[in-house]
């Protein structure tokens, strides 16, 4: 069964800036990635970015930079200023549409004990089941 992992990190340089990384563990070819916050896409969440492997990338404030890291993982940097900026307990969700497996989603938020001075672990963590 495919799985999706989500990692949320606060930037050490800008304490109100976040980096969200998401990846897909499955055999299919990814046709679309949707990143949202405040809950799952289609269930109360607000879309931050949509990444298509060929059509390109669309993003909405406070998203600053969405990009493909690998063929099966993406990253998104969020601006930290303004009324729509995220807070420490904001939930971020990533949904991967993969052919032919379908759509798989996982959500994550900043770990409670986050220290912005610590670097990200070398492997994406936590890994969440897409359920």
């Amino acid at each position: 069964t495919p799985e999706v992992w989500v990692q949320v990190r606060m930037e050490a340089t800008e304490l109100s800036s976040f980096t969200i990384r998401c990846g897909f563990l499955g055999s299919g070819s990814i046709s679309l990635v949707t990143v949202s916050w405040g809950g799952p896409n289609g269930a109360g969440g607000t879309t931050l970015a949509v990444l298509h492997p060929e059509r390109g990338i669309r993003q909405w404030a406070p998203a600053r930079q969405a990009r493909w890291e690998t063929q099966s993982s993406i990253s998104l940097i969020l601006e930290g200023s303004g009324a729509s900026s995220p807070c420490a307990n904001t939930t971020f969700c990533c949904k991967f549409a993969s052919f032919p497996e379908g759509s798989w989603e996982a959500c994550g938020s900043l770990p409670p004990s986050s220290d912005p001075g610590l670097s990200a672990p070398p492997t994406p963590a936590p890994i969440l089941r897409a359920d």
Epitope: E101, G102, S103
Partner: antibody, heavy 120, light 107 residues
Framework: EVQLQQSGPVLVKPGASVKMSCKAS????????MHWVKQSHGKSLEWIGI????????SYNQKFKGKATLTVDKSSSTAYMELDGLTSDDSAVYYC?????????????WGQGTSVTVSS | DIQMTQTTSSLSASLGDRITISCRAS??????LNWYLQKPDGTIKLLIY???RLHSGVPSRFSGSGSGTDYSLTITNLEQEDIATYFC?????????FGGGTKLEIK
């Protein structure tokens, strides 16, 4: 409004082939996968396969490999299914259904169905 | 393949009733369970996806619940237009598979 309009009923002889259509409107065909589903008379639903209209990739239920062929014509926003070597077991109603592109992997909009009757 | 079982093939109820239709998967499907209704004319509509999320335009008297292998669809305050056959479908693995259906009739 999302709509899937399927072609009309057909009566075909055993051994023949049939090609049915499913015209999509109210959305861009290439943005959603398309499923095909079989319903024999008074029975449950059987998943035949799925096509990605963006690039034509397909995946079939093992049971229907060699029986069904899924294609799309992007210019007319139409998906097609061809059934070969028809027998009485292929007499059924066939539905096209749009993939929801949401978790759950549901089929959120369905065509009205195409009735196929195989009889000599 | 994942087998989907709807043990009740037909159900009789009165208008205004609350009814529950059950569906069991042969393995854990992690909430990847969807519910459809099929009207007597053959029209099929999605009601619930991902176990409990209401599809757009579906009345709130429909609700879904469950986890693991066991799921259910509940209709409260049954209306005449709810007379249909209800199917569950798993979206967890290929091939997609459906339950045998539960036909709802009015007493």
């Amino acid at each position: 409004e999302v709509q899937l309009q399927q072609s009309g009923p057909v009566l075909v002889k055993p051994g023949a082939s049939v090609k049915m259509s499913c015209k999509a409107s109210g959305y861009r065909l290439t943005d959603y996968y398309m499923h095909w589903v079989k319903q024999s008379h008074g029975k449950s639903l059987e998943w035949i396969g799925i096509i990605n209209p963006y690039n034509g990739d397909t995946s079939y239920n093992q049971k229907f490999k060699g029986k069904a062929t899924l294609t799309v014509d992007k210019s007319s926003s139409t998906a097609y299914m061809e059934l070969d070597g028809l027998t009485s077991d292929d007499s059924a109603v066939y539905y096209c259904a749009r993939d929801s592109s949401n978790v759950g992997n549901a089929m959120d909009y369905w065509g009205q169905g195409t009735s196929v009757t195989v009889s000599s | 393949d994942i087998q989907m079982t709807q043990t009740t093939s037909s159900l009789s109820a009165s208008l205004g009733d609350r009814i529950t239709i059950s569906c069991r998967a042969s393995q854990d499907i992690s909430n990847y369970l969807n519910w459809y209704l099929q009207k007597p004319d053959g029209t099929i509509k999605l009601l619930i996806y991902y176990s409990s999320r209401l599809h757009s335009g579906v009345p709130s008297r429909f609700s879904g619940s469950g986890s693991g292998t066991d799921y259910s669809l509940t209709i409260t305050n049954l209306e005449q237009e709810d007379i249909a056959t209800y199917f569950c479908q798993q979206g967890h693995a290929l091939p997609r598979t459906f339950g045998g259906g539960t036909k709802l009739e009015i007493k």
